[in-house]
Amino acid sequence: SIQGTSLLTQSPASLSTYNDQSVSFVLENGCYVINVDDSGKDQEQDQVLLRYYESPCPASQSGDGVDGKKLMVNMSPIKDTDIWLHANDKDYSVELQRGDVSPPEQAFFVLHKKSSDFVSFECKNLPGTYIGVKDNQLALVEEKDESCNNIMFKLSKI
């Protein structure tokens, strides 16, 4: 895990896009893949386990001249909490990776509250890059316009 971070809490939620598509995790050939698709109203949505961490942001990094704190998350399918959503900075994809011990930096995302209903996930290892939706897949999106809908997600309590 990242130095200086401490676990605050964890909770399950379902994850859906701005356009009300569901993020789900499907087992294919022994590996989980991430799907973004329309799910029926009666269909039970897949859940993610969100682990919330507090991370100090020293004055030297904050740009404000004062110390700050960020709220970060990592996310696992409830079906298998030993794998994490992972930002692949090589091909700008979002993958599920199994970890032996603690999650690497690529599995941490800074939480942005975008509105009363929506959040965004900024890659810890790629500032200015967010989890987004591209062609019905999760991908890493360099967001110039932070209000862009394709980086907004709704977390629904179970």
């Epitope: 605050l8 809490t9 909770s11 919330y52 507090e54 942001c57 904050s62 740009g63 404000d64 001249g65 004062v66 700050g68 704190k69 960020k70 709220l71 800074v110 939480l111 942005h112 509250k113 975008k114 509105s115 009363s116 959040v119 932070e146 209000s147 309590k157």
Partner: antibody
Framework: QVQLQESGPGLVKPSETLSLTCTVS????????VHWIRQPPGKGLEWIGV???????GYNSALMSRVTISKDTSKSQVSLKLSSVTAADTAVYYC???????????????WGQGTLVTVSS | DIQMTQSPSSVSASVGDRVTITCLAS??????LAWYQQKPGKSPKLLIY???RLADGVPSRFSGSGSGTDFTLTISSLQPEDFATYYC?????????FGQGTKVEIK
Amino acid sequence: QVQLQESGPGLVKPSETLSLTCTVSGFSLSKYGVHWIRQPPGKGLEWIGVLRAGGSTGYNSALMSRVTISKDTSKSQVSLKLSSVTAADTAVYYCARDHYYYSSYGGFVYWGQGTLVTVSS
Amino acid sequence: DIQMTQSPSSVSASVGDRVTITCLASQTIGAWLAWYQQKPGKSPKLLIYAATRLADGVPSRFSGSGSGTDFTLTISSLQPEDFATYYCQQLDSSPYTFGQGTKVEIK
């Protein structure tokens, strides 16, 4: 260091619009949300609304039809407007800053000293 | 909107006493609860955030517990400077509602 300072008229007439400004220093409005909270004399705290780091707003549902929060980033100011005021809007008005970058989950760590607004003719 | 119910509304206690204040949310808010202390004529001060985390500079005699809907603020050994009003606030979803407050008075 981080500071928030409320300013505006201390007396507003009924049916008029209450306008207050929160001038901030020591942090960026693009990173932290700023909230308005009020406290009628001798009573508890009431959350009015928030201007989030990304620019969106959220309001107390009971006040939503009368309240507007906006910002002037160049002046490091967040403004509150409350229309059609009555005596029930008499209160100390506070602005406060989020504890965390980009979200309100951690509460409000920095507060202004508050300004008393009396609604009376 | 989420309603926050604090109890008791006031408590009389002596220096050295253990004081417990509870806060009940009308629906689950996870761990997203803060506690504030307010003295007359002053702005509120953040004591506890994320239900259990002590804010910077707050004495360790203050502690928070709970998650979901039931939360507690405990002052393990009341000091003269602790006589004040305490508020809980939920930060799970907007509007970010406060409890009605608990006044801790000198017995």
